[in-house]
Each structure stands twice: as structure tokens, then as C-alpha cells.
């Protein structure tokens, strides 16, 4: 009896660790999408509808700010898309890019810990134009860090949840 | 205020060409595109191409494609529309057109008129 | 080629009158319609963009409303100074125009 007591509290220990394990996936929010044909940061995401979620981290300022020290796993999805119903491009050579940046408050500093994109020929003669960039790395993140998106060309950000979105979660304790 | 104020009326022979300017004043020239629509008689509206003023970039309706050239003159805040090889059906009001969405602001040229020139009448007679 | 279709071709309605006028897209646009104004002899005006975005400085009476390929113009209460052709647009689409006249 003492050993299943004592299985039960060890089950009830891991699970409460593992639902206290930080985590976030955030989707673009596609009513505030800003104008830019730089690198433009995007701030305004959802933690808490459709396919989004937040769990033991905070989304502050368009930044995911962590909760806890550990090692994180970081990834970030991005669709870029044209369709000609929205009119022309202007230049038919782009460049598509995403930054995953870290700012650290205490030090005031900031990195970015992966980019990724490509230059793209996108001809006037076709209809559509669609681009996905997909970066996923793994980090030592300290409380108070925030990790902010930037991307070229947000006016032409595919707005659909399972498009464009990013997120972490943590993976193990810092020793 | 935005004001697009083209060249007078024109008339020319069957075959020959002719060049309609629009002057573009109370904004920043090279952060729009300019469009260029005609209308016939008795026709609809008939778009003809644009030009990105900030880089020259241009598009052109297959219709017109060959006989038409659109440039700028950022100095002078004025976009230019040549049209070639003229025919009698080539009769018509040439206006331009500012395309309202700011290129700093976006890549998209989403053809919303939003200021047009008063017009160039341009008659094609032998 | 999408084409751009309006009825009806012309109108006659009183000073005060509801107007509305109907253009159909041959394919879906979503909501990238605009509507225009032309008198004779001056510069068209932009009413409508976005399908129902009223453009600054146009007066409140005109309204646009609809999606996909069905889209209306209404001016709420005919006021002399409306007497024009109206068009609408889709990108490099016009359509055929619809004139209004005062009874």
C-alpha cells in the first residue's frame, strides 16, 4: 500500500512539473498587421484563441517574455502571399525574410538568435505567390528575456493562424 | 492639398504619337504610383498601365503593350504617357490617376484612384 | 480577365429618392471593389474603396456594401449635385457605368 502511495505522489509530482513546464504558441493577429516594406516588428499576436496558447509565460508588448530560467526550444512560422485580386506589386524582386530576436532587460542588449528567408523573384504574369519560412533553434533563456518577431514586407503576411505564428517551450532546467 | 494637373488637348494624325503630362503637387511624389485610364466616347473607363514613381517600375494592360511608354520626372514631380502608332479609336479623355497606397507603407499597388487629373482630351483625326 | 458588370445602365429618381446601383464581378474579388463618380468635363471623383470605406470628404449618403462578387452603391437621398455617371472598379476592371438622372 505504502508503494502505490508512493507511486501515486511521484505520478502527481511529474505531472504537476510537467503542467508547470512554460510554454507559449502564439498566432498573428490579423487585424493589426503593420505597414512597412522594411523589417517591421510585429507586436500584436494571440495567446488565448483558436489554435493559441500561453501556459507559465507572459506575452507583454508584443514580446514573450520568460517566466523561468531553462533551455527553450524556439520556432517561428512565417507565410508570405500575393494574390492579384489585392492589386500589383509594386517591385516584383523581394526580399522575405524573419528575425527571432532576444532582449535582455537587466543587460539591455538585444540578439537575434536565428533569421531566416530568402530573396524572391515574384512575376507580375502569375496570380498567386505564396512563401513559407520555417526556423526552430534551441536556447538558454533567463527570466525577464523577451523574444520579439520581425519580418520584411508584413502587407504581404498570409493572416491565417496555422500560417504565420510563433512559440516556445521549455525543454529542460539550466543545471 | 493633392492636386494632379495634366497637358492640354491634343490632336494628332492617324500613326503618329502623342505625349500627355500630369504634374503632381501637395505630396511626396516618389512614395505613389501613378495610373493612367482613358475613356472613349461613349466607352467605360479602360486603365492603360501604372508607374511606380519611387523606382520607375511600370505595368502596362496587354492592350497597349508596344505602343505605350511611361516614364517619370521625379524632379519635377511629373509623370509622362506617350502613346504610339495612333488610330481614330484612340479617341478619347486621358487622365491620370494617383494610386492611393503609400509605397513606404507597403509593396501593393492596390488601384484606388484617389486623386485624378482633370484630364487631357486627345483627338486622333486625318 | 475578371469582368466587371453594373446595372442598371441608367436611372431617373427624385431629389430625396433611395439609389442603388448593382455591380457583379465575374469571379470572386473579396472586398477589393471601389466606386467612382465622373461628371462631364471634370476630374473623377473616388467615392467608395474597399467596398464600403467611404472615401474623406465624400458626403455620407453614399454607402457601399457587399463581397465576393455581388456588390451595391447606394446614395440614401438623391441630391441634385449626384446627377453623374457612377462606376465601379476592381483593380484593372471597370464597369460599364451607370447614369443617374433627376426626374
Known amino acids: 500500500e505504502k508503494a502505490m502511495v508512493d507511486g501515486s505522489w511521484l505520478d502527481l509530482a511529474k505531472r504537476s512539473k510537467l503542467e508547470a513546464q512554460p510554454f507559449a504558441h502564439l498566432t498573428i493577429n490579423a487585424t493589426d498587421i503593420p505597414s512597412g516594406s522594411h523589417k517591421v516588428s510585429l507586436s500584436s499576436w494571440y495567446h488565448d484563441r483558436g489554435w493559441a496558447k500561453i501556459s507559465n509565460m507572459t506575452f507583454s508588448n508584443g514580446k514573450l517574455i520568460v517566466n523561468q530560467d531553462g533551455f527553450y526550444y524556439l520556432y517561428a512560422n512565417i507565410c508570405f502571399r500575393h494574390h492579384e485580386t489585392s492589386g500589383d506589386l509594386a517591385t516584383e524582386y523581394l526580399q522575405l525574410m524573419v528575425y527571432v530576436t532576444k532582449t535582455s532587460i537587466k543587460i539591455p542588449s538585444s540578439h537575434t538568435l536565428m533569421k531566416g528567408g530568402s530573396t524572391k523573384y515574384w512575376s507580375g504574369n502569375s496570380e498567386f505567390h505564396f512563401y513559407s519560412i520555417n526556423v526552430g533553434g534551441f536556447f538558454k533563456l533567463r527570466s525577464g528575456e523577451e523574444i520579439s518577431i520581425e519580418v520584411s514586407n508584413p502587407s504581404l503576411l498570409d493572416p491565417d493562424q496555422d500560417a504565420t505564428y510563433f512559440g516556445a517551450f521549455k525543454v529542460r532546467d539550466i543545471d | 492639398q493633392v492636386q494632379l494637373v495634366q497637358s492640354g488637348a491634343e490632336v494628332r494624325k492617324p500613326g503618329a504619337s502623342v505625349k500627355v503630362s500630369c504634374k503632381a503637387s501637395?505630396?511626396?511624389?516618389?512614395?505613389?504610383?501613378i495610373h493612367w485610364v482613358r475613356q472613349a466616347p461613349g466607352q467605360r473607363l479602360e486603365w492603360m498601365g501604372w508607374?511606380?514613381?519611387?523606382?520607375?517600375?511600370?505595368k502596362f494592360s496587354q492592350k497597349f503593350q508596344g505602343r505605350i511608354t511611361v516614364t517619370r520626372d521625379t524632379a519635377a514631380s511629373t509623370a509622362y504617357m506617350e502613346l504610339r502608332s495612333l488610330r481614330s479609336e484612340d479617341t478619347a479623355v486621358y487622365y491620370c490617376?494617383?494610386?492611393?497606397?503609400?509605397?513606404?507603407?507597403?509593396?501593393?499597388?492596390?488601384?484606388?484612384?484617389?486623386?485624378w487629373g482633370q484630364g487631357t482630351l486627345v483627338t486622333v483625326s486625318s | 480577365e475578371i469582368v466587371m458588370t453594373q446595372s442598371p445602365s441608367s436611372l431617373s429618381a427624385s431629389v430625396g429618392d433611395r439609389v442603388t446601383i448593382t455591380c457583379r464581378a465575374s469571379q470572386s474579388i473579396s472586398r477589393y471593389l471601389n466606386w467612382y463618380q465622373l461628371k462631364p468635363g471634370k476630374a473623377p471623383r473616388l467615392l467608395i474603396y474597399g467596398a464600403s470605406s467611404l472615401q474623406s470628404g465624400v458626403p455620407s449618403r453614399f454607402s457601399g456594401s457587399g463581397s465576393g462578387a455581388e456588390f451595391t452603391l447606394t446614395i440614401s437621398s438623391l441630391q441634385p449635385e449626384d446627377i453623374a455617371t457612377y462606376y465601379c472598379q476592381h483593380t484593372r476592371a471597370f464597369g460599364q457605368g451607370t447614369k443617374v438622372e433627376i426626374k
Open positions: 501637395g505630396y511626396d511624389f516618389s512614395n505613389y504610383a
Open positions: 508607374i511606380n514613381a519611387g523606382n520607375g517600375n511600370t
Open positions: 490617376a494617383r494610386d492611393r497606397s503609400n509605397m513606404v507603407r507597403g509593396i501593393i499597388i492596390a488601384y484606388y484612384f484617389d486623386y
